[in-house]
């Protein structure tokens, strides 16, 4: 009877830039599956006593669990499962309809370090690479998961990647986002957003690395063939990416309707909720389907733009078709046209 207490149980935490937090995926006989938070008879809003997931954190070589429950935003892979029986049991699971699944999130503390803290490889005086190459995305302090400056490590050598705007590297960016378990490439980040500017209070492991890489093959399919080592450059851009798996996503809610499944759309970025203003990039129902799904309602019945006769009506604006693609919301300080959405109510 397979459970997360079994020695041969395999799990991983995805959609984050650390192996110690993210959305829980488990390996069953036919591959990796995302675990729905509605498993084991739980509601998709219920938080659990995290200590029950101690074995998962242990297996990932992380510290003890801090929180366990619904992940705020679900990225649904091809396969998601709902499991039954005791919490943590995977012997009786069924495939879930992706739009009904809210993924299970787990955060483990970082492992206790017994040696002096450093998350960087030692300086370049050590022997040439032997460990497998790996990538890391360094977000600015308080920045987003799956967004930041790309660092490449090959054995003991690590550094940023020099990038010229004219480089035609779309395939490479997709490959890198994918390798980081961050979905697909959305856009390049200016270094201010990516957090390259050094904060004097930043921990020493975020100081600039001693070497730099240059793109060698933008169609590479394994990391060791993508980059070559160069002398660090004082100026010039470094590769900084925003991938589709970025976190946190914009949250939405419906207010002022007769149920939670209808109302004017409001969004939150940070602490404040504000009206979402209509935008020409969202004239299809795709945006509203996503909003309905986040409310755990059915598909869109209707949506209508409310008149913005009031020059003082303010709100937030997303320039993309879907809110999940919006890595930043823009303020609109006048003539904000609100949108009233009605979704199918699963519990009328």
């Amino acid at each position: 009877r397979l459970s997360w207490y079994d020695p041969d149980f395999q799990a991983r935490l995805t959609r984050s830039n650390s192996k110690c937090q993210g959305q829980l995926e488990v390996y069953l006989k036919d591959g990796w599956h995302m675990v729905c938070s509605q498993s084991w008879g739980r509601s998709s809003k219920q938080w659990e006593d995290p200590s029950q997931a101690s074995k998962v954190c242990q297996r990932l070589n992380c510290g003890v669990p801090l929180s366990l429950g619904p992940f705020l935003v679900t990225y649904t892979p091809q396969s998601s499962i709902i499991c039954y029986g005791q919490l943590g049991s995977f012997s009786n699971c069924s495939h879930s309809r992706n739009d009904m699944c809210h993924s299970l999130g787990l955060t483990c503390l970082e492992p206790q370090k017994t040696t002096p803290p450093t998350t960087r490889p030692p300086p370049t005086t050590t022997p040439e690479p032997t460990a497998p190459p790996r990538l890391q995305l360094v977000a600015q302090s308080g920045g987003q998961h799956c967004a930041g400056v790309v660092e490449f490590y090959s054995g003991s050598l690590g550094g940023t990647i020099s990038y010229e705007a004219q480089d035609k590297t779309q395939d490479l960016e997709n490959f890198l986002c994918n390798n980081l378990q961050c979905g697909s490439f959305l856009k390049h980040l200016p270094e201010t957003e990516a957090g390259r500017a050094q904060d004097p209070g930043e921990p020493r492991e975020h100081q600039p690395l001693p070497i730099q890489w240059k793109i060698q093959n933008s169609s590479c399919t394994s990391l060791e063939h993508c980059f070559r080592k160069i002398k660090p450059q004082k100026s010039g851009r470094v590769l900084a990416l925003l991938c589709s798996g970025f976190q946190p996503k914009v949250q939405s809610r419906l207010v002022g309707g007769s149920s939670i499944c209808e109302g004017t759309v409001e969004v939150r970025q940070g602490a404040q909720w504000a009206a979402l203003c209509d935008s020409s990039s969202a004239r299809s129902s795709l945006r509203w389907e996503e909003v309905c799904r986040e409310q755990q309602c059915g598909s869109v019945n209707s949506y209508r733009v409310l008149d913005a006769g009031d020059p003082t009506s303010r709100g937030l604006f997303c320039p993309h078709q879907k809110l999940s693609q919006c890595h930043e919301l823009w303020e609109r300080n006048s003539y904000c046209k609100k949108v009233f959405v009605t979704c199918q109510d699963p519990n009328p």
């Epitope: 006593d49 003890v64 801090l66 787990l106 955060t107």
Partner: nanobody
């Protein structure tokens, strides 16, 4: 709805000590991780420390490691931050936090649902 109330802030000289307390009400205290963030004037909120619900696990910012200790007393619904060898740069408003969103990074301010009002700590000679 969880309420968090901090106390214990004050004025202290460099090298001195302070102990902050945070009392929680309105939730299942022993299930929730609890933590501390701080915000110095003109700076972003910065992670200080966190402790798991059972108290068995802790994590600290590098800047406070070996000087600050987080602990909790579940019977009293209270979490503490013992701050030793205080430095000028520890001056900030200290906030107690709870309700960590599963799957989010520990050090992110927006990963915590509940925040106290804050208590001022000033280190000055």
């Amino acid at each position: 709805q969880v309420q968090l109330v901090e106390s214990g802030g004050g004025l202290v000289q460099p090298g001195g000590s302070l102990r902050l307390s945070c009392v929680a009400s309105g939730g299942t205290f022993s299930t929730y991780g609890m933590g501390w963030f701080r915000q110095a004037p003109g700076k972003e909120r910065e992670f200080v420390a966190v402790i798991t619900g059972s108290g068995v696990g802790t994590q600290y910012a590098d800047s406070v490691k070996d000087r600050f200790t987080i602990s909790r007393e579940n019977a009293k619904n209270t979490v503490y931050l013992q701050m030793n060898t205080l430095k000028l740069e520890d001056t900030a408003v200290y906030y107690c936090v709870s309700g960590h969103r599963p799957g989010w990074a520990v050090i992110r301010a927006d990963a915590y649902e509940y925040w106290g009002q804050g208590t001022q700590v000033t280190v000055s000679s």
